[in-house]
């Protein structure tokens, strides 16, 4: 799986959109989890409605939400007031019994608002590869590493 | 029981090269990402680089480029690590490390560090 | 390369004393922040991880704190075992880099 950058600024939301073969995932409940590194285990966050019909139904856990647009084959989670905790690995999961395809590998990363001026001089806006070798930037909001690609970041 | 455990001491003379092994047990190095870490006496820590052993990619800090070289077999869940054109400022410990990689990795294991001198 | 820039280098404290490490980093690092304890002749040991998260098995005296640029490693009651080398070291891009290190010695 590629990794999609999607980058929001502290404060605010920023929406993640995972898409998937509709008819291939047809009747599967989907999750979003929090993987602890690179290489780390997925914690789950928020999975959708136990209802496979009410997918379309957002469900809340604290501040992540989520919503499933079965027919169009479309995740959408939500993160409210983005945090720098915020920051890290994730990944859009479709559930078969214990089992979890992978959807998207995400990796969420939290620029700091420009409006806050709390200490200008700490203002970061990340340069086109500055996280990632060679990465491609797709305007702003999200990017994709290609395949094998590692983070460059990636301690613990 | 999980732990790293490194080769022995090593004395070399300037110009020669060396190779420190770092073998895993309790867990299987392709779930992880094998680092090496050096510290000269009485100094402070210093990354030297790191090896994805699942995929066989390595990277070096900039210093090392070229003179180091980090490889892995993961038949014998073994790391290793060569320092070629060893100079008298290359004594130091040794450490190998694994950890799931940045971004909040909650593993982390260290070796117990091997000492190379290097003296002529 | 990132720089870390701990400080003080040293510090001398006596046991119950609360202790604050800071480090800055010379770039934006998010919370990729961990900091290390270290004992002479034995490998370094983690603390807290992603900035603020204990790591398994560490007292919850200490605590980490920070983002973006600056870190703070507390201790809120030192206790004898807790003299040693501290370490941060940012995991937001390779190289990793190491603060230079705080020495917590016996006041």
């Known amino acids: 799986h590629n990794t999609t950058v999607f980058q929001g600024v502290e404060g605010q939301s920023l929406q993640v959109s995972c898409p998937y073969d509709s008819m291939k995932h047809w009747g599967r409940r989907k999750a979003w989890c929090r993987q602890l590194g690179e290489k780390g285990p997925c914690q789950r966050v928020v999975s959708t409605h136990n209802l496979w019909l009410l997918s379309f139904l957002r469900r809340r856990n604290g501040s992540t939400a989520i919503t499933d647009d079965t027919l169009g084959g479309t995740l959408t989670i939500t993160l409210r007031n983005l945090q720098p905790h915020d920051a890290g690995f994730y990944q859009c999961q479709s559930l078969h019994g214990s089992e979890a395809d992978t959807l998207r590998k995400v990796l969420v990363e939290v620029l700091a608002d420009p409006l806050d001026h709390r200490d200008a001089g700490d203002l970061w806006v990340p340069g086109e590869s500055e996280s990632f070798e060679d990465a491609h930037v797709e305007h702003s909001i999200s990017r994709s590493l290609l395949e094998g690609e590692i983070p460059f970041p990636p301690t613990s | 029981q999980v732990q790293l455990v490194q080769s022995g001491a090593e004395v070399k003379k300037p110009g020669a090269s060396v190779k420190v092994s770092c073998k895993a047990s309790g867990f299987s190095i392709e779930d992880f990402y094998i680092h090496w870490v050096r510290q000269a006496p009485g100094q402070g820590l210093e990354w030297m680089g790191w090896i994805d052993p699942e995929q066989g990619e390595s990277k070096y800090a900039p210093k090392f480029q070229g003179r180091a070289t980090i490889t892995a077999d993961t038949s014998t869940s073994t790391a290793y690590m060569e320092l070629s054109s060893l100079r008298s400022e290359d004594t130091a410990v040794y450490y190998c490390h694994a950890d799931h990689g940045n971004y909040g990795s909650t593993m982390d294991y260290w070796g117990q560090g091997t000492l190379v001198t290097v003296s002529s | 390369d990132i720089q870390m820039t701990q400080s003080p280098s040293s510090l001398s404290a006596s046991v119950g004393d609360r202790v604050t490490i800071t480090c800055h980093a010379s770039q934006h690092i998010n919370v990729w922040l961990s900091w290390y304890q270290q004992k002479p002749g034995k490998a370094p040991k983690l603390l807290i991880y992603?900035?603020?998260n204990l790591h398994t098995g560490v007292p919850s005296r200490f605590s980490g704190s920070g983002s973006g640029t600056d870190f703070t490693l507390t201790i809120s009651s030192l206790q004898p075992e807790d003299f040693a080398t501290y370490y941060c070291q940012q995991g937001q891009t390779y190289p990793r880099t190491f603060g230079q290190g705080t020495k917590v010695e016996i006041k």
């Open positions: 992603k900035a603020s």
